[in-house]
């Protein structure tokens, strides 16, 4: 339904508080380098303008699109050219090209300082002195570092952030109360950002059809009692929400997400028996809860899939009449019967089924041709099952840190051209699949592991896209969304790689390593491990293990020494020499 003023419509729907928060998120995700104060000023100007439109929708400029209004506002930033370089050229374009231009300049790895957590008392004072500014700063800092963060979900994180400070700043032991909560929010936030990044990549790189297929599979697993028509409606609505958020249309996205939560809760009897608790929660919690809700129980006595999709004489007729609807029904029926499969596996099966029908429905005897299509599924199912079994065994044998190291070596050998920080970050995250998924029973392992790996490999893909250095990474990332993980798994050692020149500086360590947290110390050691593999790609596991063990002993020894810096200088030289000898460098 058309509104005289889109900005007034969204302001009234969302309310002042959500409107201001979402505009701040949108601006921070576009102009990631701008100071906080500049963004607050822009947001206040937009808000005051929106209020004039609420008062009189016919007022000047109130009929303009949100992209026009927001883009015009962003283009008033004085230092656009100096700060952002060619992004300033976007301002010479007209909508919708200008917004597309801004979207293309979003930076997944912005050059921003690491967020350092101040002392608890300092944070509590800041919270009490100006709660509104404190919370706005949180939105701003997260949004600029995560330019695809799901905006309505960020409102939920901010609400929890506020609740943590409200509770803990009046606790007897503020730190004991607050720090675990902040750690949990940080970890959940990173995971949420990465999951949303995959949704946006799916929409932007592979199109709406790819996203809808993913959504059909996932919602059918989650709501197996829902009819196909109901799942299709939810998929359409969910696709609209995520298309909007990924496209920077955060006001529309948040509004539509709230509408979708309302619809789901009003129709939960025909969707899922697991929604009751979610639907009793406040709006932001409700939407989050619905997005994370456990799979409903499968209906009893579901008939065999073969009847409708293999044995029926009407398979080709039904397929020809409406290809995507028929394939959607296949995916729905298969997914609702298989909560034990990953979404990407279900999509591979659907693709195989589609390819078979394309070939067979043009054959002389179609039925004879596609009669054995389900047999083709067996190896596709077994491949991830076997991979997960092997890797969980390795994880249980090594523990998380050493499992990460095994993956670091594996992936550095596959794609040694990728930057060391990216290899460390991605391999550490790949390694977390062990503690995240291997504890689950067989029936939950594959959806947990393979769908998580899709999220992590997407991080590699988006980081690599910014500065492409490896044709193999580009190939695995762009050829097929659902086959990314098998593509990376299939990569062997890159024989074309010319080993990196040895640089002693890379392996020079100082006493500051002793004061680092355990996690930061691990990252230092893992960075050294990647560099070692880049220098000596043919090094054996045993050689690398020996060097890493020596390195760990060296750090431990020097951190206990009275004169730490001298120890690192002298023992470090010896370690480098011994390592070079051991690896034949």
């Amino acid at each position: 339904d058309a509104h005289k003023s889109e900005v007034a419509h969204r302001f009234k729907d969302l309310g002042e508080e959500n409107f201001k928060a979402l505009v701040l998120i949108a601006f921070a995700q576009y102009l990631q380098q701008c100071p906080f104060e500049d963004h607050v000023k822009l947001v206040n100007e937009v808000t005051e303008f929106a209020k004039t439109c609420v008062a009189d929708e016919s007022a000047e400029n109130c009929d303009k699109s949100l992209h026009t209004l927001f883009g015009d506002k962003l283009c008033t930033v004085a230092t656009l050219r100096e700060t952002y370089g060619e992004m300033a050229d976007c301002c010479a374009k007209q909508e919708p090209e200008r917004n597309e231009c801004f979207l293309q300049h979003k930076d997944d790895n912005p050059n921003l300082p690491r967020l350092v957590r101040p002392e608890v008392d300092v944070m509590c004072t800041a919270f009490h002195d100006n709660e509104e500014t404190f919370l706005k700063k949180y939105l701003y800092e997260i949004a600029r570092r995560h330019p695809y963060f799901y905006a309505p979900e960020l409102l939920f994180f901010a609400k929890r952030y506020k609740a943590a400070f409200t509770e803990c700043c009046q606790a007897a032991d503020k730190a004991a109360c607050l720090l675990p909560k902040l750690d949990e929010l940080r970890d959940e936030g990173k995971a949420s950002s990465a999951k949303q990044r995959l949704k946006c990549a799916s929409l932007q790189k592979f199109g709406e059809r790819a996203f809808k297929a993913w959504a059909v599979a996932r919602l059918s697993q989650r709501f197996p009692k829902a009819e196909f028509a109901e799942v299709s409606k939810l998929v359409t609505d969910l696709t609209k929400v995520h298309t909007e958020c990924c496209h920077g249309d955060l006001l529309e996205c948040a509004d539509d997400r709230a509408d979708l939560a309302k619809y789901i809760c009003e129709n939960q009897d025909s969707i899922s028996s697991k929604l009751k608790e979610c639907c009793e929660k406040p709006l932001l919690e409700k939407s989050h809860c619905i997005a994370e809700v456990e799979n409903d129980e499968m209906p009893a006595d579901l008939p065999s899939l073969a009847a409708d999709f293999v044995e029926s004489k009407d398979v080709c007729k039904n397929y020809a009449e409406a290809k995507d609807v028929f394939l959607g029904m296949f995916l729905y029926e298969y997914a609702r019967r298989h909560p034990d499969y990953s979404v990407v596996l279900l999509l591979r099966l659907a693709k195989t089924y589609e390819t078979t029908l394309e070939k067979c429905c043009a054959a002389a005897d179609p039925h004879e041709c596609y009669a054995k299509v389900f047999d083709e599924f067996k190896p596709l199912v077994e491949e991830p099952q076997n991979l997960i079994k092997q890797n969980c065994e390795l994880f249980e044998q090594l523990g998380e840190y050493k499992f990460q190291n095994a993956l670091l070596v594996r992936y550095t050998k596959k794609v040694p051209q990728v930057s060391t920080p990216t290899l460390v970050e991605v391999s550490r995250n790949l390694g977390k699949v062990g503690s995240k998924c291997c504890k689950h029973p067989e029936a939950k392992r594959m959806p947990c592991a393979e769908d998580y790996l899709s999220v992590v490999l997407n991080q590699l893909c988006v980081l690599h896209e910014k500065t492409p250095v490896s044709d193999r990474v580009t190939k695995c990332c762009t050829e097929s969304l659902v086959n990314r993980r098998p593509c990376f798994s299939a990569l062997e050692v890159d024989e074309t790689y010319v080993p990196k020149e040895f640089n002693a500086e890379t392996f020079t360590f100082h006493a500051d390593i002793c004061t680092l947290s355990e996690k930061e110390r691990q990252i230092k050691k893992q960075t050294a491990l990647v560099e070692l593999v880049k220098h000596k790609p043919k090094a054996t596991k045993e050689q690398l293990k020996a060097v890493m063990d020596d390195f760990a002993a060296f750090v431990e020894k020097c951190c206990k020494a009275d004169d730490k810096e001298t120890c690192f200088a002298e023992e470090g030289k010896k370690l480098v020499a011994a390592s070079q000898a051991a690896l034949g460098l």
Epitope: L14, E16, E17, A258, P282
Partner: nanobody
Framework: EVQLVESGGGLVQAGGSLRLSCAAS????????MAWFRQAPGEEREFVAT????????YYADSVKGRFTISRDNAKNTVYLQMNTLKPEDTAVYYC???????????????WGQGTQVTVSS
């Protein structure tokens, strides 16, 4: 969680005035946007007015604009609806609501009172 209790309803002649109050329990009242909705017999619940967390933004349904005023007193954990020049069509149960943002949409509010009856006779 916030508990909301409305009061001040009653029977009034057309053209008269009433002031509804909504008392909220809990220290976090000042963190919530507040609103009034109403429901006439056999009708859907409809938006009346909202006030932002800061109190700096208010918005009214066209049918009550210029006659009703919403206000809040954070020290007393109370939101008010001053209703002047009442009309028979204002007869309804009036509900107070609290949420994260000052929307005019019912589903954006998380906490609701039980309602207070307002009857305007002609």
């Amino acid at each position: 969680e916030v508990q909301l209790v409305e009061s001040g309803g009653g029977l009034v002649q057309a053209g008269g005035s009433l002031r509804l109050s909504c008392a909220a329990s809990g220290r976090t009242f000042s963190s919530y946007a507040m609103a009034w909705f109403r429901q006439a017999p056999g009708e859907e619940r409809e938006f009346v007015a909202t006030i932002s967390v800061s109190g700096g933004y208010t918005y009214y349904a066209d049918s009550v604009k210029g006659r009703f005023t919403i206000s809040r007193d954070n020290a007393k954990n109370t939101v008010y609806l001053q209703m002047n020049t009442l009309k028979p069509e204002d007869t309804a149960v009036y509900y107070c609501a609290a949420g994260d943002s000052s929307s005019w949409l019912e589903h954006m509010y998380d906490y609701w009172g039980q309602g207070t009856q307002v009857t305007v006779s002609s």
